[in-house]
């Protein structure tokens, strides 16, 4: 058993039939010695009397908010949550496995630039009685500060018969140098509580590996005289690290016909313009990627050929 | 990256082309090592990230773009020095910070070159003959060092009398390649920045 926060405790249980559970002693926060009684949640049934209450915690029915009283007055509370371990593995019932980039990916994180700011998100099918708290640091043995905001519900989607909820959090490394060469990874830890179930999820990464630039901006077409060719031009996204001559991007320009089956023409360039043939009813799309470190491509920015 | 890359103009900052070749070569070598040593801990998640140049050179700090010198987090260990030769300066008048930057890059390359050559000598003794260093990568390091053209004592190749532990050598190769790739990215960024300046 360990303290998650003031008056909230997590009991770690090996979860199998007839498991012995854990003997837990609860202490009433009072100088009083006599006339103390204990109850669980909203029930008025007295579980015991005295300054301490000894319980055997085996299942969710043993978890909850234990309250000590004296003469009708509440003295203190202790909320017990359960963390299940099945076959030596901690449960992961609350969050959905996103399976990208690999199995058992519960947290996904992205950064738009090298400023030390990043966003993580996760998915769940649970809609109520759910709380998250997020902590982060660079390195774990001598951790350096990363500040995370509150996790918020950022999207709701319908997946077949189920509703899926996306939560996200923004974090910022306290003293980040965009040009630094990372040798210690960022660690992100999410505590998830659903009703009386506690779980924790972690992710470890280098900012350089989670970079995904915003799409190029101000995508424009300029027809070339007496030709089917057009000059496509664009600019670096506002969110990308500066100076651009140091944090350079490379671009992929694609000409795509109306039908998905039509052959795509692709050009790669380090410049912010390219000359392509614009077919009728086609569209031109441009995306960006760090020129020197191949992390993710941005989403496409698109304009119609006409 | 297996994409077409435009060749630089002859009048371009002389080292940019070499640094682009360097990054391509080390990335290819790292990919080859990951594939060949698939049953060794050779991915970014599995290895310890060590920097053999730590406390010996200060490339990131010395080569910091002017725009980032206002960022206090980037200025933790800025040092200055008075090394002012080097042909990559291409007859431009330049501050000693730029000279320090280029000499720091040169020292990085020299240290990695020695490590890689020592390691290759060990790998050549491996009866499994599983992996060797790409001669192209070693040649590209050499070319960039020549283009930087700093006068520096040659460092003798480290020789070891004890029997090499090939497992440890291969893991060290992975660690070195990961670190060298990160440094090659920095070098490429620096050259691109200097070329635009």
């Amino acid at each position: 058993i360990w303290e998650l926060k003031k008056d909230v405790y997590v009991v770690e249980l090996d979860w199998y039939p007839d498991a012995p559970g854990e003997m837990v002693v609860l202490t009433c926060d009072t100088p009083e010695e006599d006339g103390i009684t204990w109850t669980l949640d909203q029930s008025s049934e007295v579980l015991g009397s005295g300054k301490t209450l000894t319980i055997q915690v085996k299942e969710f029915g043993d978890a909850g908010q234990y309250t000590c009283h004296k003469g009708g007055e509440v003295l203190s509370h202790s909320l017990l949550l359960l963390h299940k371990k099945e076959d030596g593995i901690w449960s992961t019932d609350i969050l959905k496995d996103q399976k990208e980039p690999k199995n058992k990916t519960f947290l996904r994180c992205e950064a738009k630039n090298y400023s030390g700011r990043f966003t993580c998100w996760w998915l769940t099918t649970i809609s109520t009685d759910l709380t998250f708290s997020v902590k982060s640091s660079r390195g774990s043995s001598d951790p350096q500060g990363v500040t995370c905001g509150a996790a918020t519900l950022s999207a709701e989607r319908v997946r077949g018969d189920n509703k899926e909820y996306e939560y996200s959090v923004e974090c910022q490394e306290d003293s980040a140098c965009p040009a630094a060469e990372e040798s210690l990874p960022i660690e992100v830890m999410v505590d998830a509580v659903h009703k009386l179930k506690y779980e924790n999820y972690t992710s470890s990464f280098f900012i350089r590996d989670i970079i995904k630039p915003d799409p190029p901006k101000n995508l424009q077409l300029k027809p070339l005289k007496n030709s089917r060719q057009v000059e496509v031009s664009w600019e670096y996204p506002d969110t990308w690290s500066t100076p651009h001559s140091y944090f350079s991007l490379t671009f992929c320009v694609q000409v795509q016909g109306k039908s998905k089956r039509e052959k795509k023409d692709r050009v790669f360039t380090d410049k912010t313009s390219a000359t392509v043939i614009c077919r009728k009813n086609a569209s031109i799309s441009v995306r960006a990627q760090d020129r020197y470190y191949s992390s993710s491509w941005s989403e496409w920015a698109s304009v119609p050929c006409s | 990256r297996n994409l077409p890359v435009a060749t630089p103009d002859p009048g371009m900052f002389p080292c940019l082309h070499h640094s682009q070749n360097l990054l391509r070569a080390v990335s290819n070598m790292l990919q080859k090592a990951r594939q060949t040593l698939e049953f060794y801990p050779c991915t970014s998640e599995e290895i310890d990230h060590e920097d053999i140049t730590k406390d010996k050179t200060s490339t990131v700090e010395a080569c910091l773009p002017l725009e980032l010198t206002k960022n206090e987090s980037c200025l933790n260990s800025r040092e200055t020095s008075f090394i002012t030769n080097g042909s990559c300066l291409a007859s431009r008048k330049t501050s000693f910070m730029m000279a320090l930057c280029l000499s720091s890059i040169y020292e990085d390359l020299k240290m990695y070159q020695v490590e890689f050559k020592t390691m290759n000598a060990k790998l050549l003794m491996d009866p499994k003959r599983q992996i060797f260093l790409d001669q192209n990568m070693l040649a590209v390091i050499d070319e960039l060092m020549q283009a930087l053209n700093f006068n520096s004592e040659t460092v003798p190749q480290k020789s070891s009398l004890e029997e090499p532990d090939f497992y440890k050598t291969k893991i060290k190769l992975c660690i070195l390649l990961h670190a060298f790739r990160i440094r090659a990215v920095t070098i490429d960024r620096v050259m691109s920045y200097l070329n635009a300046s």
Epitope: I1, D7, E22, V24, T27, L53 | -
Partner: nanobody
Framework: EVQLVESGGGLVQAGGSLRLSCAAS????????MGWFRQAPGKEREFVGA????????AVADSVKGRFAISRDSAKNTVYLQMNSLKVEDTAVYYC???????????????????WGQGTQVTVSS
């Protein structure tokens, strides 16, 4: 601060009995539970028995169940470990421990106790 002093250890023959005492002094009013742990040469410290101070709930390790009993005298701020039918494998240094922190905890875990005595040697000969 709470000070703990163990006594009653010594040499005893297999099958014999000993009674260990642990006297607490200092801020004893904040005591929540007291326990006994032991450490045999070359082994890790292990839980023997414990008692919650105000209510007097007790727990003992499976290895000593039926042979050892734990009790307390609140007026004297003392906890006792009555050891009967001693075996050679009970030979160890016996430590007394006290918990003064409120909140939820586990009687069996040594890191849930915040004050410790110096220990008393118990040797059981065959």
């Amino acid at each position: 601060e709470v000070q703990l002093v163990e006594s009653g250890g010594g040499l005893v023959q297999a099958g014999g009995s000993l009674r260990l005492s642990c006297a607490a002094s200092g801020r004893t009013y904040s005591t929540v539970a007291m326990g006994w742990f032991r450490q045999a040469p070359g082994k890790e410290r292990e839980f023997v028995g414990a008692i919650t101070w105000s209510v007097g709930n007790t727990a003992v390790a499976d290895s000593v169940k039926g042979r050892f009993a734990i009790s307390r005298d609140s007026a004297k701020n003392t906890v006792y470990l009555q050891m009967n039918s001693l075996k050679v494998e009970d030979t160890a240094v016996y430590y007394c421990a006290s918990r003064t922190n409120i909140g939820a905890f586990n009687l069996f875990r040594e890191n849930h106790y915040n004050y410790w005595g110096q220990g008393t040697q118990v040797t059981v000969s065959s």
